[in-house]
Interface confidence: low
Amino acid sequence: KFSKQSWGLENEALIVRCPRQGKPSYTVDWYYSQTNKSIPTQERNRVFASGQLLKFLPAAVADSGIYTCIVRSPTFNRTGYANVTIYKKQSDCNVPDYLMYSTVSGSEKNSKIYCPTIDLYNWTAPLEWFKNCQALQGSRYRAHKSFLVIDNVMTEDAGDYTCKFIHNENGANYSVTATRSFTVKDEQGFSLFPVIGAPAQNEIKEVEIGKNANLTCSACFGKGTQFLAAVLWQLNGTKITDFGEPRIQQEEGQNQSFSNGLACLDMVLRIADVKEEDLLLQYDCLALNLHGLRRHTVRLSRKNPIDHHS
């Protein structure tokens, strides 16, 4: 329960706080769990304990392991565990999942990205910020204290943001980097029960035998980015992919966002070489999201030849 995962990169500073808290006056002893060896408190050591903090200055891959901290008071002892993993530096730009801190969301009104774990370090402004490994430049980006502010946030601002700063310990400087994902949400967004714009309920679609026919299922789900929204066709209550008729396929239409901001999806059902038996099927346009499912049913009828008699 009182275990904390911590990670860092080789040759960078890493500072870990004991997961068990206590008053500043309480003593904290640190041990390397695998050997039960006490971690020294002398600052001349590369790895040393400083009260509730365990400092790797700098960290090495071999430091990886579980560290035990015991908070001692006159009346009780509390034990915590720090699971520390030190990784080799990546040669490419990609930051793997295991080095990522928690994802944060922003919007037009609130676009602060806090630099993770920075409060544990002795650092001085300014922070350096990078997005997808590129240094951030331009007036839209402002490094302010321990966070980055992005003005006029757009969906394109989503991505992985890395903060870089210098930790100072007794006059020696150590680099620290930390990366987290930033997602952009539409502040004005909302979600509705799906509204199917086409086809109309119980619509009869006229088709010609031997020709191709297209049916479009179009539905809107609200405004802004929608969570778990989909449109699809079913034949006699069966998914197209499971129905097993290669002449009948569904194809993703364009994701639409109209001038009023509505988020809509299209799914086109393509029937090649329409056959008599296709007229017997029930075609269901389904639109679903977290609010529920709406279904509009279509049937096909043979297009009558033009009657030339008066």
Epitope: Q226, L228, A230, K239, Q250, N255
Partner: nanobody, 122 residues
Amino acid sequence: ESGGGSAQAGGSLRLSCTASGSGYFYSRLCMGWFRQAPGTGREAVATSYPGIGSTYYADSVKGRFTISQDNAKNTMYLQMNSLKPEDTAMYYCAADATWNTCGITKTTYAYWGQGTQVTVSS
């Protein structure tokens, strides 16, 4: 991910990616395959929405690569045929729960795999 490795130009490989969690959750994920060659940015290869079986492909792989899934196993596959040397890259699978951005232009996914290397020699 698994299934990476080396292949000759014109050969085939099949990558697989298994998502932990319930089948209910898996079927509602937008899932994608990405690749990143040394010194280049990450590019989308193919994306899929298992719940309705709809797929998208990058122009560079259309007709050669096929994305599919086994909903019972919570697993997504990328069948790569007619491989070319320019397909050499680290391949990543990704998953996200935001559907209406599930397309080949989507790059911000909540969950990423560790990557598997694909090397195609001429």
